[in-house]
Interface confidence: low
């Protein structure tokens, strides 16, 4: 570690007295203090001497001696004290600057060790200082104002008290900055547009930022728009805002607006598009498929999604038939806006009765007229069955009735005994029908198939059954021949006629 | 059938305001889309477009000389007018009004034009 | 403002031989989201308002003969008179109207050759 000569911690002396600094180390040393006129700086070898023979109170200060060549990287100092009547303050900076809750040292330096009692922080032309400023004083380097304040911007000057009057330093201008937590917070609005040609249109686009210094423009397809910035402070931010107007907009005014802010911190962007369209426009459409096919007592929800311009004037659900003048009730309608041009509503149907199928139609409204969207709802039913003896042309025949949607499948099975229902290890015979015949095929009902089973003599030991079935489920109808007839019944556990 | 007629005076001298008429039938202006349109010809020269109004009372200018037009729309008449003040001898022309059908901007039948001369 | 630039200024075709009249326009007058140019080719004769031939670029007029068709997309459009005829002597512009000021191209003189 180098040593100074004297070696003392502090030095004080008189204006125009003579001072010597010696620095003696094991290899080369330099000396570090603040810059100040006067000094003469005289090396040899491993010693350096700094010297003046008219010291000033602006050679006050402290003066450091390092070792490069040290890799404990020692230094020692001393201070220096030019006591000057007339000048109590040695100040080695005239504007400081530091980021908001960091300390900002004011490093006016007292050139009388003696004053210290007496030193004080004021404000320019004397004013005090701002309530809540926190700060600390040392004489080797000045007053220390801790966790600095943007508001605390303000011109400072010290104060010694010098034979009972209070001597100002020239002033220290401290510019505290507003911490930036990164670029300016963006907003355009809107966040999409649409117009007709000729229609007036506004988008704005508005950065702000703790810190004035801040750039902010609005630019169309890569084009920056020259627009008159408005500018506000309020909530502790600074606010710039461009304003587009567009008195009758065409379509070179379509396309891609981006709001751009820049600060030191980088940079913010935000786009949105414009739209302008010859006439006002309706579009419905569904993600849904329009023809629907739902099982009986299942709910569904119709959706339709509305793409207008402009908004809506009108909307409805209406129910077209074929069961009943019904209508959709309100309160199983519902509407959801995905945003300002688009929008989805929704008609709810708990519970379809078999009444309620059939076609319903969305219809919407707005300047460019009148839109509809029908969806065909069908609804699904298990089969229904039926068996009747009949004789067709002198034949004795089985007759079997299904209805049910989708058109169910017929199959005949033989079995020995009488049963509700023929099981595996009694069925003799199994007949399918691939083409029964269709009695029924009215839109959104069932549909109602027939298949006929021609028997020369019935076996009066065995069944008789018909099954139907379809993607909803299966029903069946057992016919037992007995001696005074015949007999026929449908199973115990019979699918339910909705 | 459409047919459009400009009427107005054929001298005008300078610093003094133009208004022409345009009276027309075969159409209604408050048929939705319907527009009608004003077009100058200098002798000799190209055509110029000037303004147009639409059936709902959009109108649109020629920017170059927006400051000096007007233009209206008396849909019971069936008639426009078209207003130009600060008449100059470079605005010596045919002045045509024309049909543009539904919101096109185009301009599909034309009246026969009438030839306004500024000259002191 | 779009320009609109027609050329050549004038033409000489002799009769029964195509003529062709070129347009061009400073920006696109296509308009993507219908696929629609908004262009439009007038024939004015001596002493006569302008009469239109065919608007959206390529659709004819009513009443206007098949002889005259017009072709092209964006910034490049053509009028093409297939077989001229003494009476197509005029003078043809071309039109914008996708964004105001609509204008006109300064014209084409056609004449007999």
């Known amino acids: 570690i180098p040593v100074i000569e004297p070696s003392v911690p502090e030095l004080v002396v008189k204006p125009g007295a003579t001072v010597t600094l010696r620095c003696v180390g094991n290899g080369s040393v330099e000396w570090d203090g603040p810059p100040s006129p006067h000094w003469t700086l005289y090396s040899d070898g491993s010693s350096s001497i700094l010297s003046t023979n008219n010291a000033t109170f602006q050679n006050t200060g402290t003066y450091r001696c390092t070792e490069p060549g040290d890799p404990l990287g020692g230094s020692a100092a001393i201070h220096l004290y030019v006591k000057d009547p007339a000048r109590p303050w040695n100040v080695l900076a005239q504007e400081v600057v530091v980021f908001e809750d960091q300390d900002a040292l004011l490093p006016c330096l007292l050139t009388d060790p003696v004053l210290e009692a007496g030193v004080s922080l004021v404000r320019v032309r004397g004013r005090p200082l701002m309530r809540h400023t926190n700060y600390s004083f040392s004489p080797w380097h000045g007053f220390t104002i801790h966790r600095a304040k943007f508001i605390q911007s303000q011109d400072y000057q010290c104060s010694a008290l010098m034979g009972g009057r209070k001597v100002m330093s020239i002033s220290i201008r401290l510019k505290v900055q507003k911490v930036i937590p990164g670029p300016p917070a963006l907003t355009l609005v809107p966040a999409e547009l649409v117009r007709i040609r000729g229609e007036a249109a506004q988008i704005v686009c508005s950065a702000s930022s703790v810190d004035v210094n801040f750039d902010v423009f609005l630019q169309h397809n890569n084009t920056k728009l020259a627009i008159p910035q408005q500018s506000d402070f309020h909530n502790n931010r600074y606010q710039k805002v461009l304003t587009l107007n567009l008195d009758q907009v065409d379509f070179q005014h379509a396309g891609n607006y981006s709001c751009v802010a820049s600060n030191v911190q980088g940079k913010h962007s935000t786009s949105m598009f414009f739209r302008v369209v010859e006439s006002a426009y309706l579009n419905l459409s569904s993600e849904q498929n329009l023809i629907q096919e739902v099982t009986v007592g299942e709910g569904l929800n119709l959706k339709v999604m509305v793409e207008a311009y402009p908004g809506l004037q009108g909307f409805n659900w209406t129910y077209l038939g074929p069961f009943s003048d019904h209508q959709p009730e309100p309160k199983l309608a519902n509407a959801t806006t995905k945003d300002t041009y688009r929008h989805t509503f929704t008609l709810s149907l708990p519970r379809l009765k078999p009444s309620e199928a059939g076609r319903y139609s969305f219809l919407a409204r707005n300047p460019g007229g009148w839109r509809a969207l029908t969806f065909e709802l069908t609804l699904r039913y298990p089969p229904e069955v039926s068996v009747i003896w009949t004789f067709i042309n002198g034949s004795g025949t089985l007759l079997c009735a299904a209805s049910g949607y989708p058109q169910p499948n017929v199959t005949w099975l033989q079995c020995s005994g009488h049963t509700d229902r023929c099981d595996e290890a009694q069925v003799l015979q199994v007949w399918d029908d691939p083409y029964p015949e269709v009695l029924s095929q009215e839109p959104f009902h069932k549909v109602t198939v027939q298949s006929l089973l021609t028997v020369e003599t019935l076996e009066h030991n065995q069944t008789y059954e018909c099954r139907a079935h379809n993607s909803v489920g299966s029903g069946s109808w057992a016919f037992i021949p007995i001696s005074a007839g015949a007999h026929t019944h449908p199973p115990d556990e019979f699918l339910f006629t909705p | 059938q459409i047919t459009l007629k400009e009427s107005g005076p054929p001298l005008v001298k300078p610093t003094q305001t133009l208004t022409l008429t345009c009276t027309f039938s075969g159409f209604s202006l408050s048929t939705s889309g319907v527009g009608v349109g004003w077009i100058r010809q200098p002798p000799g020269k190209a055509l110029e477009w000037l303004a147009l109004i639409y059936w709902n009372d959009d109108k649109r200018y020629s920017p170059s000389l927006k400051s000096r037009l007007t233009i209206t729309k008396d849909t019971s008449k069936n008639q426009v007018v078209l207003t130009m003040t600060n008449m100059d001898p470079v605005d010596t022309a045919t002045y045509y009004c024309?049909?543009?059908?539904?919101?096109?901007?185009?301009?599909?039948?034309w009246g026969q034009g009438t030839l306004v001369t500024v000259s002191s | 403002d779009i320009v609109m630039t027609q050329s050549p200024d004038s033409l000489a075709v002799s009769l029964g031989e195509r003529a062709t009249i070129n347009c061009k326009s400073s920006q696109s007058v296509l308009y993507s989201s219908n696929n629609k140019n908004y262009l439009a080719w007038y024939q004015q004769k001596p002493g006569q308002p302008p009469k239109v031939l065919i608007y959206?670029?390529?659709i004819r007029e009513s009443g206007v003969s098949d002889r005259f068709s017009g072709s092209g997309s964006g910034t490049d459009f053509t009028l093409t008179i297939s077989s001229l005829q003494a009476e197509d002597v005029a003078v043809y512009y071309c039109?914008?109207?996708?964004?105001?000021?609509?204008?006109f191209g300064q014209g084409t003189k056609l004449e007999i050759k």
């Open positions: 039109q914008q109207y996708y964004s105001t000021p609509y204008t």
């Open positions: 024309a049909h543009s059908p539904r919101y096109s901007g185009y301009f599909d039948y």
């Open positions: 959206w670029a390529s």
